[in-house]
């Protein structure tokens, strides 16, 4: 059974992931980003189901495409380079989902824009955090 300290650690990691995803979204999703329209032409694959930490496998698999789109943005709104930002997210995702479990991600038929993709994973983080508190 999860201990209170492991629950607390999971919660902190999810909060960190949530903040990173929100920072990316805020950095790109405004009219002051002249690359926004072109960024919206990139397709992202969404999880068929995202209710447990193991489903973060689906996010992990989309981190490389996310980095490529963020490289296009070259946004001054990010304190870190896209590579470092995605690397940080990747570390958190690996810790949260656990590296021992082999979970095959199932994707939904409908693809999404970067904004929809980020909002989906932000909602996921908020949902899991709410079950932990």
């Amino acid at each position: 059974a999860p201990t209170s300290s492991s629950t607390k650690k999971t919660q902190l990691q999810l909060e960190h992931l949530l903040l990173d995803l929100q920072m990316i979204l805020n950095g790109i999703n405004n009219y002051k980003n002249p690359k926004l329209t072109r960024m919206l032409t990139f397709k992202f694959y969404m999880p068929k189901k995202a209710t447990e930490l193991k489903h973060l496998q689906c996010l992990e698999e989309e981190l490389k495409p996310l980095e490529e789109v963020l490289n296009l943005a070259q946004s001054k709104n990010f304190h870190l380079r896209p590579r470092d930002l995605i690397s940080n997210i990747n570390v958190i995702v690996l810790e949260l989902k656990g590296s021992e479990t082999t979970f095959m991600c199932e994707y939904a038929d409908e693809t999404a824009t970067i904004v929809e993709f980020l909002n989906r994973w932000i909602t996921f983080c908020q949902s899991i955090i709410s079950t932990l508190t």
Epitope: Y31, K32, P34, K35, L36, T37, R38, M39, L40, T41, F42, K43, P65, E68, V69, L72, E110, T111, T113
Partner: antibody, heavy 119, light 108 residues
Framework: QVQLVQSGGGVVQPGRSLRLSCAAS????????MNWVRQAPGKGLEWVTL????????YYADSVKGRFTTSRDNSKNTLYLQMNSLRAEDTAVYYC????????????WGQGTMVTVSS | SYELTQPPSLSVSPGQTATISCSGD??????AYWYQQKSGQAPVLVIY???RRPSGIPERFSGSSSGTMATLTISGAQVEDEADYFC???????????FGGGTKLTVL
């Protein structure tokens, strides 16, 4: 309603210059990046240039780089395209088009203005 | 430079289904957009993000994408659908905006 009204086309000799204008109304012009797209007679559409919402960033197709300059005056809600060193292959209908902030495409277009480069 | 390839023309009878293809290497990761352009008029967006229809566009217009191919389908084409149709996207880096060569749809 949301509208883009163009002016400034015409016939011009090779090597000469021409300036096109695009007046915006019905939306907050200063919140949108704007584009110019052209279409040669009987041909397809070709993206020409993009200017950011505040005019600080500009991008050009290779075919016009160094010859065309896009600019905007947000106080007048107007977009411009300055075309220098014009060539016969620049003959086309030129459209101004608004960059959508929610789609990855152009969502509002001007009516188009014809530019003919001929001696 | 990145290219989108469309058939130059297509002819269907009224009521038939018109299917216009657009081939592009980046489509597994890039959305396709479709513009309709009637003679002497500015283009109008009829499909965005592969499958979505802007408000005001009739339900007979639909889009799909699989692999490197995007498709615009007009189910039960009508005479007023006669126009040029252009697919649009950006290259794999998102840097260059690209239109297909256009498909002239004749409905007679």
């Amino acid at each position: 309603q949301v509208q883009l009204v163009q002016s400034g086309g015409g016939v011009v000799q090779p090597g000469r210059s021409l300036r096109l204008s695009c007046a915006a109304s019905g939306f907050t012009f200063s919140n949108y990046a704007m584009n110019w797209v052209r279409q040669a007679p009987g041909k397809g559409l070709e993206w020409v240039t993009l200017i950011s919402y505040d005019g600080s960033q500009k991008y050009y197709a290779d075919s016009v780089k160094g010859r065309f300059t896009t600019s905007r005056d947000n106080s007048k809600n107007t977009l411009y395209l300055q075309m220098n060193s014009l060539r016969a292959e620049d003959t086309a209908v030129y459209y101004c088009a608004r960059d959508s902030t929610t789609l990855g495409a152009f969502d509002v277009w001007g009516q188009g203005t014809m530019v003919t480069v001929s001696s | 430079s990145y290219e989108l390839t469309q058939p130059p023309s297509l002819s269907v009878s009224p009521g038939q289904t018109a299917t216009i293809s657009c081939s592009g290497d980046a489509f597994p990761r890039k959305f396709a957009y479709w513009y309709q352009q009637k003679s002497g008029q500015a283009p109008v967006l009829v499909i965005y993000e592969d499958t979505r229809r802007p408000s005001g566009i009739p339900e007979r217009f639909s889009g799909s994408s699989s692999g490197t191919m995007a498709t615009l389908t007009i189910s039960g084409a009508q005479v007023e659908d006669e126009a040029d149709y252009f697919c649009y996207s950006t290259d794999t880096t998102g840097t260059h905006r690209v239109f297909g060569g256009g498909t002239k749809l004749t409905v007679l």
